[in-house]
Every structure is written in C-alpha cells, then in structure tokens.
Interface confidence: medium
Amino acid sequence: MEPRAVADALETGEEDAVTEALRSFNREHSQSFTFDDAQQEDRKRLAKLLVSVLEQGLSPKHRVTWLQTIRILSRDRSCLDSFASRQSLHALACYADIAISEEPIPQPPDMDVLLESLKCLCNLVLSSPTAQMLAAEARLVVRLAERVGLYRKRSYPHEVQFFDLRLLFLLTALRTDVRQQLFQELHGVRLLTDALELTLGVAPKENPLVILPAQETERAMEILKVLFNITYDSVKREVDEEDAALYRYLGTLLRHCVMADAAGDRTEEFHGHTVNLLGNLPLKCLDVLLALELHEGSLEFMGVNMDVINALLAFLEKRLHQTHRLKECVAPVLSVLTECARMHRPARKFLKAQVLPPLRDVRTRPEVGDLLRNKLVRLMTHLDTDVKRVAAEFLFVLCSESVPRFIKYTGYGNAAGLLAARGLMAGGRPEGQYSEDEDTDTEEYREAKASINPVTGRVEEKPPNPMEGMTEEQKEHEAMKLVNMFDKLSR
Amino acid sequence: MGCTLSAEDKAAVERSKMIDRNLREDGEKAAREVKLLLLGAGESGKSTIVKQMKIIHEAGYSEEECKQYKAVVYSNTIQSIIAIIRAMGRLKIDFGDAARADDARQLFVLAGAAEEGFMTAELAGVIKRLWKDSGVQACFNRSREYQLNDSAAYYLNDLDRIAQPNYIPTQQDVLRTRVKTTGIVETHFTFKDLHFKMFDVGGQRSERKKWIHCFEGVTAIIFCVALSDYDLVLAEDEEMNRMHESMKLFDSICNNKWFTDTSIILFLNKKDLFEEKIKKSPLTICYPEYAGSNTYEEAAAYIQCQFEDLNKRKDTKEIYTHFTCATDTKNVQFVFDAVTDVIIKNNLKDCGLF
C-alpha cells in the first residue's frame, strides 16, 4: 500500500480501516531499508500523522501495528525530524518501559509493544543526532541499566534483552555524557560484568564452554561493546583494590570468551570484541590471562598455562590475513600481547619462541615470507603509523627491548621507524630492562653472522667497489657531484 | 673399524679451528661496521631525528644545554614574524589594524638592535600585537606560498612564556628549533657487536678527501623528506617545488654509482602536519596527475610510491619507508588509544537498522 493511501486512511480516522491500511503497509515494507524519492513527501506526511497519534497515546489494541509502521518509517532519513521530538521520544520510551517516571506502569508491560518501541528507539538514536541528544537528556540509560540489573531476577525474552543492550551500546557509543553516567553513577562495569557472567552461564572457576549458543553470543557481543565504550577512556586512570578485583573478575570472564567458540560463524567477531575489551583492562589486571590452572591437555610453558596466550596468538594470525580495517583488526590484540609479554617473563619467553624463534634462515630478508615474524616485520614499515608502532613495539618487547637483538631479528632498515620514534637510533640504553632474558644463536646464524648485512638482516655478499679502477682524481670528481647535490638539498 | 685421532692430530684440528675462528672474528669486525649517511633538505626533520635521540635516551638535554638554545629560539621566533611581515607585502595583504604598520617598522629596528639570547619586553610586545593582527593571521594561513619555518606558530603562540626574563627552553622547544646544518657531523655508536658510524651531511664543501672517505662503503642512507612540503609554492630563486627537488635528489642518490648496493631508509617526516594540510590543500598542487582522494592514507601512499618508483634496481636495492612525526615525543609512548575511536566507529557502522 502506498504511503499516501495510508495517510488518507489515517485522516478519515475509521479505526478498522486505519489498522488494515497500516498492516498492509507493514507487510509490504517490512524489508524496505531504502526509499523511493518520488514518495518522500507522502512518507513525511504519514510520519507526521503517526507522531500526532503517538503523542496523544496509541490505542492498546493496535499498538504493535502502529509501532511497526513507525519503525519502518524511522529507517527513512527524511522522516527522522518528525519522530525526533521530545514528546515522541518520551512516548516511545514509555512504551519501552524505560522512561524515568514517578509511578511504575501498573500491569506487566506487553513484551511485543516493548520490543517494537525499543527497535524504533534504536533506529532513531542510530540515525538522528537530535534523538541522541533527547535520549541523553531523558536519561533513558538509567532505566535501561536498571532493567539489565533485573535479568537475574525476572525472565525477559532474548529479544528484549538484546535490544536493551543494543540501545545501551548506541547511547554510549554516541554520547560521552551517557558513557560517563553509566560508568560512574550507574556502576556500569559491575552491572555489565554481572550480565556477561549470566549470559555466558559460567562461574569463573569452571572450564571454558565449548560453544556459546547463537542468542547468548549476540547478547554477549553487545555487552562487550558497551563495556568497551565505558572503559576505554576511564581505565587509564589508577584503580583501587576494589576496582582491580572487579576488573580481574571481568578478565576471567574474558578469558572464557577467548577460549570459547561462538555458534554459527561468529567466533572471530566474538573474539574480536573480547580482545578489544581486554585492551582496556588496567595493565595490572592482565595477569588473570596467565592464571588458568594447568589441566590435562593444556599448553604448559615454564610451569604456566599458556592456553589463553596461545589462543590470542592464533587470533592474531587469523587477523593478519586481512587487508581491510587492519588497524582495528591487529592493534588491540598486539597491544594485549605486548603488555602481557612486557610484564610476564614466561609469556614473553613463550611468545618469543613462537614468533621469533632462533634464526636459521639468514638468507632471506626478515620481511619476506609467510611466518608470523615476516608478517609482523612487514607491518613495521606500514603507512599507518599506529599499525607500524604496535607491530614494532610487540617485536621490540619480545627482544626484551634490547636494540641489538631487535636489529638482529628485524634488520636496522625495518627497525629504524621505532628506533627513531623512541630516540634509539643511536643506541640509547645498551640493553633492555629484561637482562635475565637470554638469546640463543643457532649454528646457522653463527656461521653466517659475518656476512649478514645488519640493515637488511640477511646474508649478502660483499659488493664490488663501484669505484674500483678509478683514479683519485675521478673519485674526487664523483664525490663533488654528490657534494653539490647535498648542498642543493640542505639549502 | 672406526678411526682414532692421535693427540697431535687433535691439537692440529684445534689449532685449525682456532685460526678459522680468529679469521671469522676479524671478518666479522669489518663486516659488523655499519656506515650510515644521513641526508635531507633544510626542513626535512633530519636534525630533529638527531635531537630526538638526545631527548629520549641520555635523559634528554640538561638545563645547561637547554639554556644554550635560548638564542636559537629567539632568533627563530623573530625570523618567523619577519618572514610573515615581508610576505604580506608580496601577497598584497593589509594589516587588520592600520596601527600595526608602525609596529612592523619598529620590529625591524628592534630586531636589528636585539642582543643575542635576549628579548626585551618592548620587542615581545611588538611581536605579540603583530601576531594577533587579523591581516598577519591571514598571511600566516597562506604560508605555503612563501618560506616559513614549521615552528613559527608554536613559538609565536607561546610568546608570553618565551619572553619571560627567566625563560629556559623546554625539551619540546629545543626539538622545534631550526639551525642550518653545515659540513659533516660524524656520530659513532655501538649496538653490542655492531659498530655504527653515522655521517650527518650538511651542504658545505669542506676538503674533498673527507668526502670520499664519507661515501665509500656506505651500508645505508637515511634520507629525510618533509611530507608537508608538498604544497609549498616556489620562492623566486627556485626552479621547482621542494618536494620535487627532494625527489630529484633522491633519484640521483638512489641510483648513483657510489650507492648501487646501498639500502635506503626513507623517512617521510611531519606526517602530522601533512595530515592536517591534506584536508585543505589538494595533492594535485604537487602532483597534477594525481587522481586519488585527499585522505591521508591515499595521498601518503601515493607520495611513497613516487619515491620508491625512482629506484632503478628494485631487485637488489631495498628501500625501507617510515612515516614519522618527529617532533612529538609523546607519540613515542606506546598507546592503544588511537585505535579506540576507530573501533567504536566501526562497531556503529556494523549496526544495521531494524
């Protein structure tokens, strides 16, 4: 049904005809996400009519139908202005049961109505800056947070929980004031850590899940995203013991997430959100990643369970295959691995053994090849300085921040970027702060060491002297040509 | 039956091994000597790399050393404001307030009489009034059309602090200073068993013998280029834009017979300034044939290719390109923060409508 016909039906006001028109429109457009310009004015007119009824109050019998039409039109940018008013937003928040109010709604809310209103709010907040501002002013985050806190005590359908969390994500992603409110006033980290534990269905002592079901995966990912939003600009501060205990507990849940698979093909996405959040944990809380008990079949190194570190390394390998969105794909996992390696000798030695094993192939440049080391060295000259820095820093820490060792594994040419940025191009401190870390040379390396060009990091034959056979006079002439060039350059 | 070695044979084998080892060690000593040539145009960020080294290790410049830079800071500040005032005449820009013309005349008088390492309150006042003038600001915003030190705004915005009688330059102030390097500065440093000799080459023609010793057996050339030079308009005495000049010289050096097997470490510096500029000044100013977008990623990658494509021996000669932001010592601290905004934006992008 055309929007004009629906608008006409609305204006005549006969209830059954209106409901039928709306239903027909909803059926036809349930999957419409782009709209025809020709009917734009009709849709705007329909939106205005819907809003006037919404603000006066929808009849209980047909609320879901009306809200579905509003949801469809809220996908259309040209209708946003009609819906993004204080009254409309308040009405939708009331139907979603998230309006700040004096009296609770007496009867239990209709879950279908609640769900449709939440979907409308999600669409509006995602697309309209005005709606974002009004939602923040209306403090919708408060009731959303309160409802998330009730998930343990009352059963809410998966979809309601998912859209609560999605709306929380949108508000915290788009509004710094809401972020602060959820983090500080509403103790969002504790609230969402509890919700994550409930969603994962684990107690921290248990073994990791094998596969997280689809619905739980969806909810867990929303929780991880909200936690990321509220912690990324807050946890850089020092944390007291009580908070540290909370973050460590969150860390144990994230450890579960890293080790678990997600239903469908969503494991990498799920792990991605987990690793992003790990990057926000206070550094002193990352030790939980190495605190897993050793058990049958776990990967043991220097008496420590390396299952989690190994899983993160596997995740890094997978991410390095991508060319798209490289910065956000590899920086978080490299950052987490770097900090683990920096603080924990067993982790550093394990990672070095995996990523920078003793050099054997000294005939190939460090950046050539398909080993993890080669891929990371390639990133050291990447165009994006953030990507370059995280890759170089990771390898530097694996070399115990020893410049000679770093040059040995990567070549001075590749290392120059990090060394310049750190003011270490001409040395700096002679050794890293990890003097107890030994580096072993293979026989192959020892044999070839004299022929390795430190700049390229591979064996190179001594090139013939290009000036061979020239007289001193000729050499001086060539030299002066260069000098003139440099003179030009430095002017 | 297995064969056994007599004691003499064993000793001979040991001796032979020892000789091999000694030969190998002598060879290694020579082989582990790395000769670096540091090259770059006037404002390429080359000297900053050297200064940066100093700041981050060796606990930076001492207060004494910083004090010695006071005169350079004042000179850089005065030269910057003078360069802007002179350019106003050339670009036909008027002062916002006509009274500033008197200040400009006064500036030249006071600057000529200024004692090195001192800035009088009178001179500071004149500079401050001029810098605030809307005409001066308009001219500053067109600085790509004349030669202006990159640190001009840094010092001029901080004049209140700099003009204090008890002023001591900070590490960041020192990093921003600009002194013309001449001749060759040789630095030696050692990484364990690697012995490095770095020759920072200025443009003065000193004795020829010294140059030859400089160019023989170079392991790598560090070549610095300021990315942000791409949109600078030619000065009257120049034949080509600074970026093209750098490329031409890079070409000559990269393919020079002295350096056939010499790796090149190419530092494309001032990426922060470039990132700001590219939003306003299209890359076509420098490369009219450029058809890409004016985003940092695409434009920077294009410049990188322009330089790397000059290498005529791609099979045997390596170019290691590093994009850097040399004046920002805070950039050195390892941070994941740069990525967080991108993560949130992408998470939002992945949110569909319902």
Epitope: A145, E146, H187 | -
Partner: nanobody
Framework: QVQLVESGGGLVQAGGSLRLSCAAS????????AGWFRQAPGKEREFVGA????????KYADSVKGRFTISRDNSKNTVYLQMNSLKSEDTAVYYC????????????????WGQGTQVTVSS
C-alpha cells in the same frame, strides 16, 4: 553488610522544609533500591516513598505525593528525602532502608535499616 545512617531531622514550623539524608557504608548500596518509612508515636511504621537503584523510578505514598521528593547520588552512596509544605501529621521518626530485590512499599522486601532521625513539625 550495609550500615545506614540518617541525618537532617529536627524541629520545623508547619509549611517549612527539611532535607533528610541517608548515607551508606558500603559501595554496594548503589546497587540497591532504597525506601523511606516513618513511624509516628503509637502508630505502625508506614511507607513514605521509594527509589530504584539507578534512580529511574520513584514511588510515593498518597499522603506525601507532590510534597516529598526522593533522589539519590550513587557517587556519594547517599539517598535524600526532600520534604516541603510540612504538616504536623508528618511528625515521626524517619527511617531509611535498602532492598537488594526491588523497590516498593512492602517492609519485608527491605534488608537493611537505619536507626532513624526525628522530625517534629510544630504548628
């Protein structure tokens, strides 16, 4: 264990205002709903008002609606009761209580109680 301490009570003239505070000893208080109750001499303890842990919902007894307002500041672990247009029948000992289950008028859903603060309204 959460300890609650009420303050701000006193003697006030009819028509006047008072603001009561209820400070909690534990940070966990911010995750609890809170309520105010009162007990006049010789009478049963009665519900005055309640607030959810985030402050998103409030509920009041009919006798105080429009005159009393409950709010909370979770960063200070404190709940407030602002009392305006006081009447002599508001004279009572005012108690603050916290509930880890839900907020509402039922006394038995509240786990922790304060010692109370006396409010006297003189006519």
């Amino acid at each position: 264990q959460v300890q609650l301490v009420e303050s701000g009570g006193g003697l006030v003239q009819a028509g006047g205002s008072l603001r009561l505070s209820c400070a909690a000893s534990a940070r966990t208080f911010s995750r609890y709903g809170a309520g105010w109750f009162r007990q006049a001499p010789g009478k049963e303890r009665e519900f005055v008002g309640a607030i959810t842990w985030g402050g998103g919902r409030t509920k009041y007894a009919d006798s105080v609606k429009g005159r009393f307002t409950i709010s909370r500041d979770n960063s200070k672990n404190t709940v407030y009761l602002q009392m305006n247009s006081l009447k002599s029948e508001d004279t009572a000992v005012y108690y603050c209580a916290s509930s880890s289950i839900e907020f509402g008028p039922l006394e038995d859903t509240y786990d922790y109680w304060g010692q109370g603060t006396q409010v006297t309204v003189s006519s």
